[in-house]
Every structure is written in structure tokens, then in C-alpha cells.
């Protein structure tokens, strides 16, 4: 089903992982496909097997080395190919010359923790994971807080336009359960996108002291 609309999209996590998604309408679910990476200035090639994630899309991770190793730089170009088995041979289904640092998507922030909580405010910190030292401080964050009776989609986005791995949430309601998420994006890269949202951190504000005006 070559005539079905197809798309191939990959992102580099800035260290040692290129994650790819291949979608093709009308393709058979049991089709065996893989992504092959061929850098222009490295001695290694890498392949990963595309595994189904939905009716018409497949995904895989090209693991280039240890998670925190810097396997690619801003000058690298990686030729990526989608290969699908047809009978006894492999057929090229998509090709792309991929500039890793133009196509960044970092790992979700980790280690979220409540530093300090009061009745109306909460200080939360987090860490970035597997982010290149090349960025120095050129990162930005978005955060959102889930309030009772609302959805994540309704939560207003808080933007941190600098590498600030903490936030002080204010004007919270006492004795109330909240959840918090954060995501990160480098400033570099024409096709760079936000990381996935972090795992939600649940916290509860302190109850108002009895007899005190709140």
C-alpha cells in the first residue's frame, strides 16, 4: 500500500538517542520495517526495528551509545532510511538527511519534588535528563498545574524563558490536592519541539490555621 499517505519523523534527544515514528495509511500491521542511521562523519551505523504503536504507525529508538554520551554534534548529518521487508528483500520507504541539532526533543524532566509547601504556595524543583552540555543555559520550560475539577488541557501554561529548574506556585487554595507537570525545550533548532510532559507530581497545600483569616 505505497499509495497511502506516509510520513517519517525523527527527533534527537541531544545525547545518544534518535526516536522515530513511521506512519503509512493502508500498510499491513505485520509488515517488518526498520530504521537505519548512517552518519556522515562517524564510523558507526545503527538500526532499530519499528514496532507498531497504532493501526498505521510504528516507532523505534536508535540507541547510539550510553545514555549520557554525546554521540552527535551540531555539524553532523545522519542519513536515515525506513526499510520494509518485501518477500526476500528490503525496500526503502523513506529517506531523510537529518540534522540532529535542528530536530531536538529532550527527555521529559525527572526527579520532581516539593521543596516547600504552604497554605497558598508551593515550591517545586526538577532536573533535566540526558540534555547536552552544548545548550549551556539555553533552555526554556513550560509548566502546568492541575486543579480539582479541571483537566490538564484546561490548565494555563506557565512559561519559564530561562534554565530555571524550580518554580514557586502561588495563589493556591489551602488544603487542596494538586498535580504539577513540566516540560523542556532547547532554544536551538528549526524543527525542535517540546519534550514530553514529566510524570505528574501530586502535592497538597497545607490547611489554613484555625481561627486565622485566610
Amino acid at each position: 500500500a505505497v499509495n497511502g499517505t506516509s510520513q517519517f519523523t525523527c527527533f534527537y534527544n541531544s545525547r545518544a538517542n534518535i526516536s522515530c515514528v513511521w506512519s503509512q495509511d493502508g500498510a499491513l500491521q505485520d509488515t517488518s520495517c526498520q530504521v537505519h542511521a548512517w552518519p556522515d562523519r562517524r564510523r558507526w551505523n545503527q538500526t532499530c526495528e519499528l514496532l507498531p504503536v497504532s493501526q498505521a504507525s510504528w516507532a523505534c529508538n536508535l540507541i547510539l551509545g550510553a545514555p549520557d554520551s554525546q554521540k552527535l554534534t551540531t555539524v553532523d548529518i545522519v542519513t536515515l532510511r525506513v526499510l520494509c521487508r518485501e518477500g526476500v528483500r528490503w525496500r526503502v520507504m523513506a529517506i531523510q538527511d537529518f540534522k540532529p541539532f535542528e530536530n531536538l526533543r529532550l527527555m521529559a524532566p525527572i526527579s520532581l519534588q516539593v521543596v516547600h509547601v504552604e497554605t497558598h504556595r508551593c515550591n517545586i524543583s526538577w532536573e533535566i535528563s540526558q540534555a547536552s552540555h552544548y545548550f549551556e543555559r539555553h533552555l526554556e520550560f513550560e509548566a502546568r498545574t492541575l486543579s480539582p475539577g479541571h483537566t490538564w488541557e484546561e490548565a494555563p501554561l506557565l512559561t519559564l524563558k530561562q534554565k530555571q529548574e524550580w518554580i514557586c506556585l502561588e495563589t493556591l487554595t489551602p488544603d487542596t490536592q494538586y498535580e504539577f507537570q513540566v516540560r523542556v525545550k532547547p532554544l536551538q533548532g528549526e524543527f525542535t519541539t517540546w519534550s514530553p510532559w514529566s510524570q505528574p507530581l501530586a502535592f497538597r497545600t497545607k490547611p489554613a490555621a484555625l481561627g486565622k483569616d485566610t
Partner: nanobody
Framework: EVQLVESGGGLVQAGGSLRLSCAAS????????MGWFRQAPGKEREFVAA????????MYAESVEGRFTISRENAKNMVYLQMNSLKPEDTAIYYC??????????????????WGQGTQVTVSS
């Protein structure tokens, strides 16, 4: 925005050769994946070949593999399709296509945003 103009089509005998050219205008050409498609009378437009922006990656339709070669010259904003051992079934209008910058070259028309007007290739037996 990329504008594409094809040339080099014509009438050729079976077994002969033609070289199609695609002239591109637009500053983003040198980092854009390119492809050739064709449409025979009464048939749908079909994929022929594609090339990545550095020229390191190429792919071909099964029907033309080993006979056609896609190449490009970024300094001149040109893409070429060298067609050898032509067959009557290669008769079609040949279109040059450009993917949006940052997107992969694929075998489906939907992967390409910019198209030329086409050049006619007729192979007589």
C-alpha cells in the same frame, strides 16, 4: 516556497535514454528532499525516485530500479533523472516534487508540498 520547472522530456525509441532536469528556485532548496513522480494516461500519479538534500540517500520505484538514476547539484539548484533502457511503459508526464524542508522524502504524493508543471516523456516501440 520552492518553484520547480522540469525540462528534458521528449520522444525516444525503446531502449534509448533521456535526462530530465528540474530547476528549483527558493533559498531552501539545498536542504530540501526532492522526488520525481510520473502519470501515465488514465493512471494515477506514481512515485519514481527520490533523493535527500546531500545526495547521500536515494530510493527508487521497483519498476525503474537499475535503469533510472536520480542526482542533484545544489550549487545550481538542480535535480536530475537519468533514464536509461527506456520502455514504452515509461511513457508519462514526469513531475518534479519538493518536500517541505525538514521533512523526509517518501513514496506517497502527500509527502510533497511543491510540484512542477511536468514534462512529457514518450517512448515508442
Amino acid at each position: 516556497e520552492v518553484q520547480l520547472v522540469e525540462s528534458g522530456g521528449g520522444l525516444v525509441q525503446a531502449g534509448g535514454s533521456l535526462r530530465l532536469s528540474c530547476a528549483a528556485s527558493g533559498r531552501t532548496f539545498s536542504t530540501t528532499e526532492m522526488g520525481w513522480f510520473r502519470q501515465a494516461p488514465g493512471k494515477e500519479r506514481e512515485f519514481v525516485a527520490a533523493i535527500t538534500w546531500t545526495g547521500r540517500g536515494t530510493m527508487y520505484a521497483e519498476s525503474v530500479e537499475g535503469r533510472f538514476t536520480i542526482s542533484r547539484e545544489n550549487a545550481k539548484n538542480m535535480v536530475y533523472l537519468q533514464m536509461n533502457s527506456l520502455k514504452p511503459e515509461d511513457t508519462a508526464i514526469y513531475y518534479c516534487a519538493a518536500a517541505r524542508r525538514g521533512r523526509a522524502a517518501v513514496r506517497s504524493e502527500g509527502g510533497y508540498d511543491f510540484w512542477g508543471q511536468g514534462t512529457q516523456v514518450t517512448v515508442s516501440s
